[in-house]
Amino acid sequence: APVPPGEDSKDVAAPHRQPLTSSERIDKQIRYILDGISALRKETCNKSNMCESSKEALAENNLNLPKMAEKDGCFQSGFNEETCLVKIITGLLEFEVYLEYLQNRFESSEEQARAVQMSTKVLIQFLQKKAKNLDAITTPDPTTNASLLTKLQAQNQWLQDMTTHLILRSFKEFLQSSLRALRQM
């Protein structure tokens, strides 16, 4: 697993470097999670042919994965810092149940899956400190999440492999959009 942000050898070698700003820390955290997702996607694509499957659209309709839309204010046109930040935090909170689902889906990258999950929790904390309008952020209902987890695990092997692939792909896209938006804040 990659070394978490702030613990790499460069930081040790440069003790006089300025401490990271809040925005730099968030940026670095997202890039770290994206590296982890790449490693997990590699295992998924090697293990099955999901990455070339034409049945993605069918399966994707059955997963209510967070997605950036124009109204969320995260795109260059119609950019709105506060609305966008709320969307990023809400989306990450919604992704948590899917990251929990991923925990038992990997053989050789088990630690990597755990690292992505824990780093996302840390990222949410960073972003919550940055957000002023925390009242607008809705936390997913634990009972609903438990039900969703069971439903995902009730699928057959092929559907679970497809679900894993779609979660990783959607989470990567969501984080990339978030990274671009946060760099404008």
């Epitope: 069918l58 987890l149 559907l159 679970q160």
Partner: antibody, heavy 115, light 110 residues
Framework: CQSVEESGGRLVTPGTPLTLTCTVS????????MSWVRQAPGKGLEWIGI?????TTYYATWAKGRFTISKTSTTVDLRITSPTTEDTATYFC???????????WGQGTLVTVSS | AQVLTQTPSPVSAAVGGTVTINCQAS????????LGWYQQKRGQPPKYLIY???TLASGVPSRFKGSGSGTQFTLTISDLECDDAATYYC??????????FGGGTEVVVK
């Protein structure tokens, strides 16, 4: 090779609690939900309940209070709280939820409830 | 309670013929496609045929075809073989992780 096997079926008298066990191999119970299904002699399939990889349970309306599903790392148990003659059936364990799951089944274990 | 109603039962056709089995849900199945079909022969556990309403399970011949969404589903078996004689069940998943089977349809091959 992925497989499931039921055990524990036997002749019991009405009211005597009975626990059936489903032993899995070749896959992890933390990744898959598991269902219990029964079939009375000459009748159709009847879904009893399901337990998720994280231990959450859901039951058919008619089965609530009559059955309890629990699990360990390699087994899933079905406890028949207070069997009646109507519970005489072959009990199957299946991986996942019937429909989009239910891809691997055991051979079943026969429970006979009689006085 | 969630109910799946299968019709007709029994159904019979000659070798090489076609049979169609219908399955109607009392409410929409989860994601409109959480529905599968199983084949069961006497003394055996059910065999997985179709999932997601229309996707063939591994090793199932293309003579078996599933269709439908929401509340109405169909299993069609074409080019009937003697070995297709069995009871067929539809099974659906509903909101809140509740599952159900249809009553079963016996297929007789003449």
């Amino acid at each position: 090779c992925q497989s499931v096997e039921e055990s524990g079926g036997r002749l019991v008298t009405p009211g005597t609690p009975l626990t059936l066990t489903c032993t899995v191999s070749g896959f992890s119970l933390s990744s898959y939900a598991m269902s219990w299904v029964r079939q009375a002699p000459g009748k159709g399939l009847e879904w009893i309940g399901i337990i998720g990889g994280f231990g959450t349970t859901y039951y058919a309306t008619w089965a609530k209070g009559r059955f309890t599903i629990s699990k360990t790392s390699t087994t899933v148990d079905l406890r028949i709280t207070s069997p009646t003659t109507e519970d005489t059936a072959t009990y199957f364990c299946a991986r996942g939820g019937p429909g989009n799951g239910g891809d691997i089944w055991g051979q079943g274990t026969l429970v006979t409830v009689s006085s | 309670a969630q109910v799946l109603t299968q019709t007709p039962s029994p159904v019979s056709a000659a070798v090489g013929g076609t049979v169609t089995i219908n399955c109607q849900a009392s409410q929409s199945v989860d994601d409109n496609n959480w529905l599968g079909w199983y084949q069961q022969k006497r003394g055996q556990p059910p065999k997985y045929l179709i999932y997601s309403a229309s996707t063939l399970a591994s090793g199932v011949p293309s003579r078996f075809k599933g269709s439908g969404s929401g509340t109405q589903f169909t299993l069609t078996i074409s080019d009937l073989e003697c070995d297709d004689a069995a009871t067929y069940y539809c099974a659906g998943g509903f909101s809140g992780n509740i599952f159900a089977f249809g009553g079963g349809t016996e297929v007789v091959v003449k």
